[in-house]
Interface confidence: low
């Protein structure tokens, strides 16, 4: 039942009752795919083949353009290499991300020759800066891929840009990389398929350990073909990897390499007929949902299946203390390739591999002091035996009866008159969004999915790449290959005309204000709003 | 100190058998993965077969289905059955246990070896 | 024949830094770590570097090894006559079923 939405919206729709504005890309661009909000400032900016915007929130189509292609030498070069001229042979934009006040800091493919640079937007939105700063252009291996059509994952803090990308024009190794600031670069160990294999990045980010600043760690999160030994056959697994912020490799042995790189394998199933699960194992997106406790975000993921023949997708939601818990766990070992991997039982060193050195968890101020034996383990048992299990053991979404998959996800913590809802918005591979709200049941991990809206976004079906949420504007802002799509995060009018519609609905960003359905604000006038998230009960509540 | 002890060897006929044993000390057995390795008289080192901790073994092409490598945790001993010998199995026998830290095949300890000869 | 190919011999005045290169494929060399063995005349295989340039523990830093794309090699410095031995790499074969490959093996004298 909830698998019907309640409402159904097509693209003509959508522009008929002005829920959607569409920036439909330049003629010589293309590939809206890396964003970066800025609320502040009331800015989006996108990255795309040889521009990038910066977007109004409140209206995308008041923006601004930056145009920074590669020289014809270079596109020359990249022609000459066999790469396609319009395909390759451009200065795709990868990352994109706020560098200190007043610039940030973009990296593109540059033809097969990643470049870097930094990008003027002045002290105060009113400054109205947006400008290339061309006199400072800097080598952009090891933080953009070479390929376009390769992931990369990226975050820069405090000056250090984090990226999980290829570093070669290959495209064969992969590594996360920390690069800018005053420190060596640092990277995972090459050329070892347990550290990394074949991966493909989806996303990293800061979540601090402790209250010392000292324990905080970067998680990336990414997919990637699994061991020989870990599966029969070629499969794939959802992963999450640790490093410390202050890890700046060993002395002895992995010099300039990560210390405390860990990976845990991320499971997103379903019990399947005969006792065999249906895996849920590419995983396509992740939002973190930050709520009263930074070091403890709710972890979203977007997954679809492996298989050609059977064609689905899921949505998991992970504790942060269930992933601490799985790195504190057994580590994997096994005795050689095609070996069974098994819990590591042996004597593990001190202190604990993956261990932040800071004075909170004990003696060693830096991963240089680590002792030789520390090193030597974590070089060779970079995953953990356990993986990490979604919060209720199952996927608090589940399509498989239809023509698309998903591809991203965004979510929204919504306060309702009967408490506090997490909204999500799905994007798909053929330019639908899914409007989404988990309402507890008996208890508040055990999640019921209602389907509140789907609607089509960009003219053509093209698959969404990119989104991201603005609960200061209240707005959704969508990317694709072909362009740039902004829509509101409610339609509460299009609900219906009476308040049984209103209620039915159960959308949390609605409620029947006694004329009409209208966008809900907890107020001290409670008894005027009508509104049933948990149940949808008109009987009750619109009654009198 | 560890301590891995072969025995075993001696002169068999083509076609016979024989049991090599690995007694090990020193270290938790059950814990590391074993290996046989040899050495062909004034040749190099050949892999034969190993076992894992689980207990899953592994063997060269030219031994396979020949020899049968186990373990008994409780004796902390290594065995190799070796039947159907051929001369070219004239060899020095090692055991080796392999670096519980490095999870490769980088072998810490080995025996000093026991020769096995294959003659009629 | 050797999966590994290593030169049969070597050699090396005292003092002197020598070389021995060791030659694999994609499969071993390239994909996996590689180790080096010493084994001194009339005595079992002892191990000399580990995850390619890794020294256990009580082996002189004399002894160093390293990797590139599918060779590896292991230089000796400072040359002792105690050095004289035979010298074996190793690696995993992925292409094999949980097989190590060794080297042929380079006998290195000390003149």
């Known amino acids: 039942k909830n698998n019907v939405p309640r409402l159904k919206l097509s693209y003509k729709e959508m522009l008929e009752s002005n829920n959607v504005i569409t920036f439909n890309g330049l003629a010589n661009s293309s590939s809206y795919h890396t964003f970066l909000l800025d609320e502040e400032r009331s800015r989006l900016y996108v990255g795309a083949k040889d521009h990038i915007f910066s977007f109004d929130l409140v209206n995308i189509k008041d923006f601004q353009k930056i145009v920074w292609p590669v020289s014809y030498t270079r596109r020359d070069e990249c022609k000459w290499a066999g790469k396609d001229i319009l395909k390759e042979c451009a200065n795709f934009i990868k990352v994109l991300k706020a560098y200190n006040q007043t610039h940030l800091y973009a990296c593109g493919t540059g033809a097969f020759h990643p470049i870097c640079t930094y990008i003027e937007i002045g002290h105060h939105p009113e400054d109205n800066i947006f400008k290339l700063e061309n006199s400072h252009f800097e080598n952009g291996r090891g933080k953009s891929p070479y390929d376009p059509k390769l992931l990369t994952a990226s975050l820069l803090i405090d000056g250090e840009l984090y990226s999980g990308t290829a570093a070669d024009f290959m495209g064969r190794d992969f590594a996360i990389f920390r690069t800018l600031g005053h420190h060596h670069p640092i990277r995972t160990e090459q050329h070892d398929s347990r550290w990394l294999n074949d991966p493909k990045f989806i996303s990293a980010h800061l979540i601090s350990e402790s209250d010392n600043p000292e324990d905080d760690k970067v998680y990336f999160f990414f997919r990637e073909n699994a061991i020989d030994g870990e599966h029969s056959g070629k499969a794939t697994h959802a992963r999450i990897g640790q490093i410390c912020k202050n890890d700046f490799g060993g002395h002895r042995s992995l010099v300039n390499k990560w210390t405390t790189f860990l990976k845990a394998r991320l499971i997103c199933s379903v019990p399947g007929p005969n006792g065999i699960d249906t895996h849920f194992d590419e995983l396509q997106d992740v939002f973190l949902m930050n709520f009263k406790d930074p070091k403890n975000p709710v972890v979203y993921g977007v997954f679809t299946t492996s298989s050609n023949i059977f064609k689905g997708s899921a949505v998991c939601m992970y504790s942060m203390s269930d992933v601490r818990r799985v790195f504190l766990g057994p580590y994997a070992h096994r005795d050689g390739p095609n070996y069974q991997w098994v819990p590591y039982q042996g004597r593990v060193p001190y202190p604990r591999p993956g261990t932040c050195p800071s004075k909170t968890f004990g003696g060693f101020d830096s991963t240089k002091d680590l002792p030789d034996d520390v090193i030597t383990f974590a070089r060779s048992h970079p995953a953990m035996y356990n993986p990490v299990f979604p919060m209720n053991n199952r996927p608090i979404v589940i399509k498989t009866d239809v023509n698309y998959q998903f591809t991203q996800i965004v979510v929204d913590r919504v306060d309702a008159e009967d408490g506090q809802y997490d909204v999500m918005f799905i994007g798909t591979d053929v330019g639908t969004v899914l409007k989404v709200v988990s309402i507890p049941k008996e208890t508040w991990y055990d999640l019921e999915e209602v389907l509140l809206e789907e609607m089509t976004v960009f003219r053509e079906p093209t698959a969404i790449s990119a989104m991201e949420l603005s609960t200061k504007q209240q707005q959704l802002y969508i990317g694709s290959t072909a362009g740039v799509a902004q829509l509101p995060l409610h339609r509460c009018d299009i609900y219906g005309k009476a308040c049984a519609e209103c209620c039915l609905a159960r959308d949390p960003y609605c409620a029947w204000d006694g004329s009409a359905c209208s966008r809900y604000f907890p107020t001290a006038k409670r008894r005027t709003r009508r509104q049933d998230i948990r149940n949808g009960d008109p009987l009750t509540h619109c009654s009198d | 100190e560890v301590q891995l002890l072969e025995s075993g060897g001696g002169l068999v006929q083509p076609g016979g058998s024989l049991r090599l044993s690995c007694a090990a000390s020193g270290f938790t057995f059950s814990s590391y993965a074993m290996s046989w390795v040899r050495q062909a008289p004034g040749k190099g080192l050949e892999w034969v077969s190993a076992?894992?901790?689980?207990?899953?073994?592994y063997y060269a092409d030219s031994v396979k289905g020949r020899f049968t490598i186990s373990r008994d945790n409780s004796k902390n001993t290594l065995y190799l059955q070796m039947n159907s010998l051929r001369a070219e199995d004239t060899a020095v026998y090692y055991c080796?246990?392999?670096?519980?830290?490095?999870?490769?095949?980088?072998?810490?300890?080995w025996g000093q070896g026991t020769l096995v000869t294959v003659s009629s | 024949q050797s999966v590994l190919t290593q030169p049969p011999s070597a050699s090396g005045t005292p003092g002197q830094r020598v070389t021995i290169s060791c030659s694999g494929s994609s499969s071993n060399i390239g994909s996996n770590t590689v180790n080096w063995y010493q084994q001194l005349p009339g005595t079992a295989p002892k191990l000399l570097i580990y995850y390619d340039d890794l020294r256990p523990s009580g082996v002189p830093d004399r002894f160093s090894g390293s990797k590139s794309g599918t060779s590896a090699s292991l230089a000796i410095s400072g040359l002792q006559s105690e050095d004289e031995a035979d010298y074996y790499c190793?690696?995993?074969?992925?292409?094999?079923?949980?097989?190590?490959?060794f080297g042929g093996g380079t006998k290195l004298t000390v003149l």
């Open positions: 080796a246990r392999r670096d519980d830290y490095t999870s490769r095949d980088a072998f810490d300890y």
């Open positions: 190793a690696a995993w074969d992925d292409s094999l079923n949980g097989y190590v490959v």
């Open positions: 076992i894992g901790t689980g207990g899953d073994t």
